[in-house]
Interface confidence: low
């Protein structure tokens, strides 16, 4: 339904508060370096304009598209050229090219200072003094650091952020109340950002078909009682929502997400028996709850898949008539029967099935050709099962920190050209799969582990894309979305890598390490470990463990010393010499 004024339409649908919040998120995700006050000024100008259009949809410029209105507003920023360089060239383009240009300049790793959490009393004072500004600042800081954060979900995080301060700033022990809540929001926020980043990468790099296939598999696992037509409708709507959010159309995205939640709740009888509680919640909580809802029980007595997809004489006829619909049905039927498989495994099976039909339906005897297609699935299923079993055993033996270290060594040897901070960040996240997934029973391990690894490896891919340094990473990231993890798993030590020159400065430490949190101290040690492997890629596990042992001992010793700085200087020289000797450098 066409509206005379798109901006008025969205303002009325979303309400002023959500409208302003979403425009702020959109602007902060595009212009990530701009000061908070500049963004607030732009948002207020857009909001005032929207109100004039609500009052009179025929008023001047009210008929313009949101991209045109928002793009024009962004292009009024005086310091665009000096702050953003070539991004300023986007302003010379017309829509839709201008918006595409802004999208291409989104930076997954912006050069912004780390967010430092002030004292609790300071935060509570700021919250009470100006609640609105305090919450806007939260949206701004998250959005500019996570330019693909799922905007309607960020509104949900902001609501929880506000609730935490409202409750805890009145508590007897403010810190004990507030800090765990903020830690939880931070960790959930990072996870949410990374999950959404994969959805956007899927849409932008591999196209709508790839995203729809992912959505069919996931929704079929989640809603196994829903009919194929119902799942297809949900997939179409969900694809629209994520296409909009990934494309910077945040007002449309939030509006359509609300409509989708409304539809799901109105039709829950034909979708899932698990939605009742979600559908009783307010809008933001409802949408979040639906997105996280547990899988419904599988219908009893589902027939064998072979009947329709292998034994039927109409397989090639059905395939030829509507290839994507037939493959979608295959994926739906397979996924609803296998909540124990990862989505990426289901997609690999569907791809194998598609490849087999392409080949066999052109053969002299198609049925004879594809009769054994399900046998081809066995190794595809066993590979992630075995990998997860081995890695969970290793995790249980080592614990999270040492498991991360094992992965750091493994991945640095595979792709040593990748920057050390990226290797540390990605390997630490890969290592978290242990505590996240290995506690689950067998039936839940694979969907937990492999789909989580897809999210983490996508972080590697988007960070690497910004400054490509390894052909092997580029190859694994671009060839196939569903085979990224097997591609990285299959990489061996890079024999072409020329070891880095030894630089004692890299291994010089100071007394400040003693005051770091345990997590930050781990990161320091893990950074040193990556650098060691880059210097000596052929170092054995034993050699690396010995050096890391001595490093841990050195830190412990000097942090206990009276004159810490002198200890770090003197013992540090000994450590470097001992490490060089141990590694034969």
């Amino acid at each position: 339904d066409a509206h005379k004024s798109e901006v008025a339409h969205r303002f009325k649908d979303l309400g002023e508060e959500n409208f302003k919040a979403l425009v702020l998120i959109a602007f902060a995700q595009y212009l990530q370096q701009c000061p908070f006050e500049d963004h607030v000024k732009l948002v207020n100008e857009v909001t005032e304009f929207a109100k004039t259009c609500v009052a009179d949809e025929s008023a001047e410029n009210c008929d313009k598209s949101l991209h045109t209105l928002f793009g024009d507003k962004l292009c009024t920023v005086a310091t665009l050229r000096e702050t953003y360089g070539e991004m300023a060239d986007c302003c010379a383009k017309q829509e839709p090219e201008r918006n595409e240009c802004f999208l291409q300049h989104k930076d997954d790793n912006p050069n912004l200072p780390r967010l430092v959490r002030p004292e609790v009393d300071v935060m509570c004072t700021a919250f009470h003094d100006n609640e609105e500004t305090f919450l806007k600042k939260y949206l701004y800081e998250i959005a500019r650091r996570h330019p693909y954060f799922y905007a309607p979900e960020l509104l949900f995080f902001a609501k929880r952020y506000k609730a935490a301060f409202t409750e805890c700033c009145q508590a007897a022990d403010k810190a004990a109340c507030l800090l765990p809540k903020l830690d939880e929001l931070r960790d959930e926020g990072k996870a949410s950002s990374a999950k959404q980043r994969l959805k956007c990468a899927s849409l932008q790099k591999f196209g709508e078909r790839a995203f729809k296939a992912w959505a069919v598999a996931r929704l079929s696992q989640r809603f196994p009682k829903a009919e194929f037509a119902e799942v297809s409708k949900l997939v179409t709507d969900l694809t629209k929502v994520h296409t909009e959010c990934c494309h910077g159309d945040l007002l449309e995205c939030a509006d359509d997400r609300a409509d989708l939640a409304k539809y799901i709740c109105e039709n829950q009888d034909s979708i899932s028996s698990k939605l009742k509680e979600c559908c009783e919640k307010p809008l933001l909580e409802k949408s979040h709850c639906i997105a996280e809802v547990e899988n419904d029980e599988m219908p009893a007595d589902l027939p064998s898949l072979a009947a329709d997809f292998v034994e039927s004489k109409d397989v090639c006829k059905n395939y030829a008539e509507a290839k994507d619909v037939f493959l979608g049905m295959f994926l739906y039927e397979y996924a609803r029967r296998h909540p124990d498989y990862s989505v990426v495994l289901l997609l690999r099976l569907a791809k194998t099935y598609e490849t087999t039909l392409e080949k066999c339906c052109a053969a002299a005897d198609p049925h004879e050709c594809y009769a054994k297609v399900f046998d081809e699935f066995k190794p595809l299923v066993e590979e992630p099962q075995n990998l997860i079993k081995q890695n969970c055993e290793l995790f249980e033996q080592l614990g999270e920190y040492k498991f991360q270290n094992a992965l750091l060594v493994r991945y640095t040897k595979k792709v040593p050209q990748v920057s050390t901070p990226t290797l540390v960040e990605v390997s630490r996240n890969l290592g978290k799969v242990g505590s996240k997934c290995c506690k689950h029973p067998e039936a839940k391990r694979m969907p937990c582990a492999e789909d989580y690894l897809s999210v983490v490896l996508n972080q590697l891919c988007v960070l690497h894309e910004k400054t490509p340094v390894s052909d092997r990473v580029t190859k694994c990231c671009t060839e196939s979305l569903v085979n990224r993890r097997p591609c990285f798993s299959a990489l061996e030590v890079d024999e072409t890598y020329v070891p880095k020159e030894f630089n004692a400065e890299t291994f010089t430490f100071h007394a400040d390490i003693c005051t770091l949190s345990e997590k930050e101290r781990q990161i320091k040690k893990q950074t040193a470990l990556v650098e060691l492997v880059k210097h000596k890629p052929k170092a054995t596990k034993e050699q690396l463990k010995a050096v890391m042992d001595d490093f841990a001992a050195f830190v412990e010793k000097c942090c206990k010393a009276d004159d810490k700085e002198t200890c770090f200087a003197e013992e540090g020289k000994k450590l470097v010499a001992a490490s060089q000797a141990a590694l034969g450098l």
Epitope: K545, D549, D550, A553, K557
Partner: nanobody, 123 residues
Framework: DVQLVESGGGVVQPGGSLRLSCAAS????????MGWFRQAPGKERERVVS????????YYADSVKGRFTISRDNSENTVYLQMNSLRPEDTALYYC????????????????WGQGTLVTVSS
């Protein structure tokens, strides 16, 4: 089978010295950090000293600094604890332990334990 066998314990007067030894077998000795723990009657077990795999790094509890010295001989698969200026409060069962990684203090980080050797400091 991994075995850690302590020896050298006994009764000694305050101010006296003892040298404890711990002979290891069944493991690649040079791949393990070694430590000495002690447990006095009615008290929790505490780490006294430890030494890294190559011997380059040592840890001493504040209560024994300057009096006890740990050393290791990787060719002999043995770790030693030289105890000087002994005090009555050093009376305890002394355990030798091996850690796959340099351990920062918690006993759960040590993989193998000996049976212990008793040290009694008394006049």
């Amino acid at each position: 089978d991994v075995q850690l066998v302590e020896s050298g314990g006994g009764v000694v007067q305050p101010g006296g010295s003892l040298r404890l030894s711990c002979a290891a077998s069944g493991l690649t000795f040079s791949s393990y950090a070694m430590g000495w723990f002690r447990q006095a009657p009615g008290k929790e077990r505490e780490r006294v000293v430890s030494i890294s795999r190559g011997g380059g790094y040592t840890y001493y509890a504040d209560s024994v600094k300057g009096r006890f010295t740990i050393s290791r001989d990787n060719s002999e698969n043995t770790v030693y604890l030289q105890m000087n200026s002994l005090r009555p409060e050093d009376t305890a069962l002394y355990y030798c332990a091996a850690a796959r990684y340099w351990a920062t203090g918690s006993e759960y980080e040590f993989d193998y334990w000996g049976q212990g050797t008793l040290v009694t400091v008394s006049s």
